[in-house]
Interface confidence: low
């Protein structure tokens, strides 16, 4: 079976301040088992934006029902975008592990730029 790929189709997305940003991400396989997380940034200081497994992320909604059987769409929408939200967002697949899940594969990233609110 082909190894899972994490596909972020848009290299960049531009959104006006105050609007919602949709960041698209899809997997090519259900294997390996494990959660999806979204991060802003790629290195050690990356910020967790959404964790499928746990946590409270009031500004983030998932585009499709993640608990649905055979779901491969892990796109998210972030509401009320501000200039501080600008950055590169990575969709990351984790492999279920004990005691901790292990990072398996990252998407190529989608750069979010924020335009001034139209007057």
């Amino acid at each position: 079976e082909d190894e899972l790929q994490v596909i972020q189709p848009e290299k960049s997305v531009s959104v006006a301040a105050g609007e919602s940003a949709t960041l698209r991400c899809a997997m090519t396989s259900l294997i390996p088992v494990g959660p999806i997380m979204w991060f802003r940034g790629a290195g050690a200081g990356r910020e967790l934006i959404y964790n499928q497994k746990e946590g409270h992320f009031p500004r983030v909604t998932t585009v499709s029902e993640l608990t649905k059987r055979n779901n491969l769409d892990f796109s998210i929408s972030i509401s009320n975008i501000t200039p501080a939200d600008a950055g590169t967002y990575y969709c990351v697949k984790f492999r279920k592990g004990s005691p901790d899940d292990v990072e398996f594969k990252s998407g190529a990233g989608t750069e979010l730029s924020v335009r001034a609110k139209p007057s």
């Epitope: 802003r40 940034g41 290195g43 050690a44 200081g45 910020e47 200039p83 501080a84 950055g87």
Partner: antibody, heavy 120, light 112 residues
């Protein structure tokens, strides 16, 4: 002017706590993180941890876990680093540094440092 | 933790001559996004460190073009094409791919 201005030197007794401040100006404080790095006399640089001014997320060096707390006050664009249960080997210059961009965690702006001396 | 090893420890230089500092990491610093999470800093005597190079080879704002960074994976080099008197100080490499970010031990550059 883009700068980080740190609080003044401190002399503390072993077992005490110290809180160092770092006031940012000239840029949008919430667009970056603040990292804290210390340097013992004549030694190299040691990363202590960082805090996101964007959402308050923190990450601390394991050896300091439980003794260090990093906070921000976005209303005054100020970051704070508190270190508790001070020991003599905590004597160092403590620097705050701006994390250039949370995509690329280089430290592109540094404060001038705060000397903390721990002595009985 | 990722261990960063710099060499040499000390580097006596002649103004106008080139200089080179090596930095090795115990793990690859190349992320799948194509960037090497390796930065170079200079700490001049009595001053705070200042950023020279970020993400392996990108010169920071205001840094003279005589400074260049190269390398990928685990082996990196900082080159000064023509050393000037103001370049003296301690040079540090630092990785930020994994927490905790770690610094090399430093290379002291001094004029011969």
């Amino acid at each position: 002017q883009v700068q980080l201005v740190q609080s003044g030197a401190e002399v503390k007794k072993p077992g005490a706590s110290v809180k160092v401040s770092c006031k940012a100006s000239g840029y949008t404080f919430t667009s970056n993180g603040i990292s804290w790095v210390r340097q013992a006399p004549g030694q190299g640089l040691e990363w202590m941890g960082w805090i996101s001014a964007y959402n308050g997320n923190t990450n601390y060096a394991q050896k300091l876990q439980g003794r260090v707390t990093m906070t921000t006050d976005t209303s005054t664009s100020t970051a704070y680093m508190e270190l508790r249960s001070l020991r003599s080997d905590d004597t160092a210059v403590y620097y705050c540094a701006r994390v250039g961009n949370m995509d690329q965690e280089y430290f592109d702006l540094w404060g001038r440092g705060t000397l903390v001396t721990v002595s009985s | 933790d990722i261990v960063m090893t710099q060499s040499p420890l000390s580097l006596p230089v002649t103004p106008g001559e080139p200089a080179s500092i090596s930095c090795r990491s115990s793990q690859s610093l190349l992320h799948s996004n194509g960037y090497n999470y390796l930065d170079w800093y200079l700490q001049k005597p009595g001053q705070s460190p200042q950023l020279l190079i970020y993400l392996g080879s990108n010169r920071a704002s205001g840094v003279p073009d005589r400074f260049s960074g190269s390398g990928s994976g685990t082996d990196f080099t900082l080159k000064i094409s023509r050393v000037e008197a103001e370049d003296v100080g301690v040079y540090y490499c630092m990785q930020t791919l994994r927490i905790p970010p770690t610094f090399g031990g430093g290379t002291k550059v001094e004029i011969k």
